[in-house]
């Protein structure tokens, strides 16, 4: 059931009133308004949009709306010296050049300030050499190349297809392999769904379309020049040589027309197996270098982008809580886009705008939430989650004491098949209960709940009759709140059918073709999926801000902790000889999980029985729930990743987008058979088991009776 306990309440001022006020037509209108020109971070256009949102949020009725600015490191192409890649002959003549820009979509031919495709934060350079095709440039792809095929990437330019993992991990892997440059391209196997036309006639990627994106390896640091602290007016900035996470070799993205020209000449080794072949009519030879007739030709990169300290602007809106104003529920999503941002981020920003409008309408009628709601329009997400991270760094002391929950609101859609949710286990029951109350927008599920269509289309692999909810990874603005500060977090969007659509993300991701028309014509003409996502995100915020008892169930954490302990144990047991030799025991971890399970169960019983009319006891119980996520934070952070401090979850070291459970143990075990000093390596495994067991036990004790 929904809650309606705040002050000045009338019967209509409840969850239903809030949800009924959300309108698909408004989301459509807001999306159109936000997507007519580019809003690249650090540009005047994005500053103007920040001021517009500030003004509109004030009109909608928020108590205050402020701009929070920071001066952070951004990256832009050189306007007079474009980036491109050439094939050069033995005389050094350029016999083929990649395109300098994407052909603009219909109706946008005269739009200025469309940034050409580039890899943000690439260093400058003009390396030339032989090409090596490295598949997706994943850790396992380089293992295959180096260990099985004995192919050395040192001094080579590598070409990798986009997909499967975050592009920054690809670049890091290429650097570690000794490459001197990286070419990233979109293969039709990953970005062209069969039976669908290319934009503007469908939602597929045309051959001239290119995915932009940053190639940093920040590991949660935020602004590369001010890790751990806000990039404010008195900040001390590192020199560029000491900046966090910058790539050391030139990187550039291309489309599949240009990739065809590079890949069709490849010689050397054949692809090791079919998983290395994409959909282009090329052999997918690994190289190194071109085949016979073309063996004297080389590839040359021309990269002239510059890194610049630039001002960015977050918009922070406040709706003060009536009962617990010092408890914050945050709804945040980014505003900056690579070009028009038709999906990323404006399909999310339009939903946030409508959620703010609905809350504002209720507030104007005399309602207030129990707890304070903060709304955020983040800047520079595309450049490394910079706006959200700097704001959280500036406000960390408030957030760690007052932060109840963070709900992320980037792209509302990446497909139109079913719901996709990633969140802390504390929110599982909230999401289940909410989606049972919402109508499904899906064809064939008229009159059925969202929970029902979601469960049917995306069933949990473990629990029958329940939907899949995934672990939080990173690659979006919840990172600092969850991974660094330990604030319970969640995200929801509509997604594709992963069974039938094997392409990575959505085909037009970060291209010039991500327009309003893409959404309005092909993804969600009625904006019914956007409305559903608004109801899920908004409903979560409403319940988190307004329920008397926080809608967190600690028993669900107990269930996943046991599952994660089982999984990491089984990974470790794949090395039985070493486990025996070094006397590796998981007793402490399983014992801690058992204790957590028992204490969580008892806490849940007390939660049912306590006197909710006693404000002190109510606050005490709610604080135990709020601080449970915080209890999984290790102040020392993970090895070599000080800003990833959550012991249960971290972004995978091999793919920033994916979440890994018990990441400290997992990383200690990864590729352990190749470590030069096994005794030291297994000692680190034992240490990480100790850290995990201690943390789980310590978290359990926060749920014990206080005295």
């Amino acid at each position: 059931k929904s809650s309606n306990e705040a002050t000045n309440i009338t019967p209509k001022h409840n969850m239903k009133a809030f949800l009924d006020e959300l309108k698909a037509e408004n989301i459509k209108k807001f999306l159109y308004n936000f997507t007519q020109i580019p809003h690249l971070a650090g540009t005047e256009q994005n500053f103007q949009l920040a001021k517009q949102i500030q003004s509109q949020w004030k009109e909608f009725g928020l108590d205050s709306v402020e701009l929070a600015h920071y001066d952070v490191l951004l990256s832009y192409p050189n306007k007079t010296h474009p980036n491109y890649i050439s094939i050069i002959n033995e005389d050094g003549n350029e016999i083929f050049n990649t395109s300098l820009f994407e052909p603009p979509p219909p109706g946008y031919e005269n739009v200025s300030d469309i940034v050409p495709p580039f890899s943000a934060f690439s260093p400058q350079g003009m390396p030339e050499g032989d090409l090596v095709y490295v598949n997706y440039a994943r850790t396992e792809d380089f293992f295959k190349l180096e260990r099985d095929m004995k192919i050395n990437c040192s001094g080579k330019i590598v070409i990798a297809r986009y997909g499967k993992v975050f592009r920054g991990n690809k670049v890091k892997n290429a650097q570690l392999a000794g490459a001197k440059g990286v070419i990233l391209y979109s293969d039709p196997a990953d970005y062209f769904a069969p039976g669908v036309k290319s934009y503007p006639d469908g939602w597929n990627l045309p051959g001239g379309g290119v995915q932009r994106g940053n190639i940093l390896n920040l590991n949660g640091a935020g602004d590369p020049l001010t890790p751990g602290y806000p990039a404010n007016e008195y900040a001390y900035r590192r020199g560029i040589a000491e900046a966090v996470g910058l790539p050391s070799i030139p990187v550039h993205p291309i489309g599949y027309y240009d990739a065809q020209k590079l890949l069709e000449k490849m010689g050397g080794s054949a692809p090791p197996d079919s998983s290395w072949r994409g959909s282009l009519k090329v052999p997918y030879n690994v190289g190194p270098g071109f085949t016979g007739n073309f063996s004297t030709q080389k590839v040359k990169m021309h990269i002239h982008s510059t890194n610049e300290v630039t001002r960015i602007y977050n918009v922070i809106g406040t709706l003060r809580g009536a009962v617990e104003p010092d408890r914050y529920v945050i709804l945040g999503g980014h505003r900056d886009s690579w070009v028009f941002g038709g999906i990323d981020p404006q399909s999310g920003a339009a939903v946030v705008h409508e959620i703010v409008r609905s809350f504002g309408t209720l507030k104007k009628e005399g309602w207030r939430p129990r707890r304070t709601i903060l709304f955020a329009s983040w800047d520079a997400e595309e450049f490394g989650l910079l706006g959200s991270t700097e704001w959280a760094e500036e406000n960390s002391r408030l957030l760690q004491e007052r932060g109840v929950a963070y709900i992320n609101a980037d792209s509302s859609i990446e497909g139109n098949y079913t719901l996709r949710v990633d969140c802390t286990p504390l929110m599982y029951s909230l999401v289940h209960n909410l989606t049972k109350e919402l109508k499904s927008p899906d064809e064939g599920f008229e009159g059925k709940s969202l929970y029902e269509s979601w469960t049917k289309k995306s069933p949990s692999p473990e629990f029958s009759g329940m939907p899949r909810i995934s672990k939080l990874g990173s690659g979006n603005d919840f990172e600092v709140f969850f991974q660094r500060l330990g604030i319970a977090s969640g995200r929801a969007r509509y997604t594709k059918n992963w069974e039938t659509n094997k392409f990575s993300g959505y085909p037009l991701y970060h291209s010039v073709y991500e327009t309003y028309e893409l959404v309005e014509k092909f993804y969600d003409p009625m904006f019914k999926y956007h409305l559903t996502v608004a109801q899920v995100r908004g409903g979560m915020v409403f319940e988190l801000a307004n329920s008397i008892v926080l809608p967190f169930d600690c028993r669900d954490y107990a269930v996943v902790l046991r599952k994660y302990a089982d999984k990491i144990y089984s990974i470790s047991m794949k090395h039985p000889q070493e486990m025996k030799t070094y006397s590796v025991s998981f007793d402490s971890l399983f014992s801690a999980v058992k204790n957590f399970t028992e204490i969580a169960s008892k806490f849940s019983e007390r939660l049912q029985d306590f006197d909710k009319s006693n404000p002190i006891v109510l606050r005490m119980m709610n604080d135990q729930l709020m601080f449970l996520e915080r209890a999984f934070i290790d102040p020392l952070g993970l090895p070599d990743r000080p800003f990833y401090r959550h012991v249960i979850y971290a972004p995978s070291s091999h793919n920033k987008y994916a979440g890994e459970s018990f990441p400290g143990i997992y990383d200690a075990l990864f590729d352990i058979e190749s470590k030069v000093d096994p005794s030291k390596a297994w000692g680190e495994v034992k240490r990480q088991i100790y850290v995990a067991a201690f943390t789980v036990q310590a978290a359990a004790e926060t749920l014990s009776e206080v005295a």
Partner: nanobody, 112 residues
Framework: EVQLVESGGGLVQPGGSLRLSCTVS????????VSWVRQAPGQGLEWVSS???????YYADSVKGRFTISRDDSKDTLYLQMNSLRAEDTAVYYC??????WGQGTLVTVSS
């Protein structure tokens, strides 16, 4: 004191089946994951399968689809059902709690 005692080994023809059991004592069985590990003659230890405290199962590629691990918490017993046995499955099979607590092993010989 933790004890793990395996039984059920023996001689079986290729293609045949066998069911191993491991009875445990000295710890609360249902709170822990447990495993089967084997050692073929003249070879090192090889992980075969694990079952989690939550009931999740994990298998080595070499036995996937042929072996099934299970547990009966009420009897403090772990099982390994082995079907479609091959000569290369010949080994001493150990029940293991982790790197510290192991059984003495039971010999499985697959031969015609």
């Amino acid at each position: 004191e933790v004890q793990l005692v395996e039984s059920g080994g023996g001689l079986v023809q290729p293609g045949g089946s066998l069911r191993l059991s491991c009875t445990v004592s000295g710890f609360t069985f249902d709170d822990y994951a447990v495993s089967w590990v084997r050692q073929a003659p003249g070879q090192g230890l090889e992980w075969v399968s694990s079952i989690g405290a939550g009931g999740g199962t994990y298998y080595a590629d070499s036995v996937k689809g042929r072996f099934t691990i299970s547990r009966d918490d009420s009897k403090d017993t772990l099982y390994l059902q082995m079907n479609s046995l091959r000569a290369e499955d010949t080994a001493v099979y150990y029940c293991a709690k982790d790197g510290v607590d192991w059984g003495q092993g039971t010999l499985v010989t697959v031969s015609s």
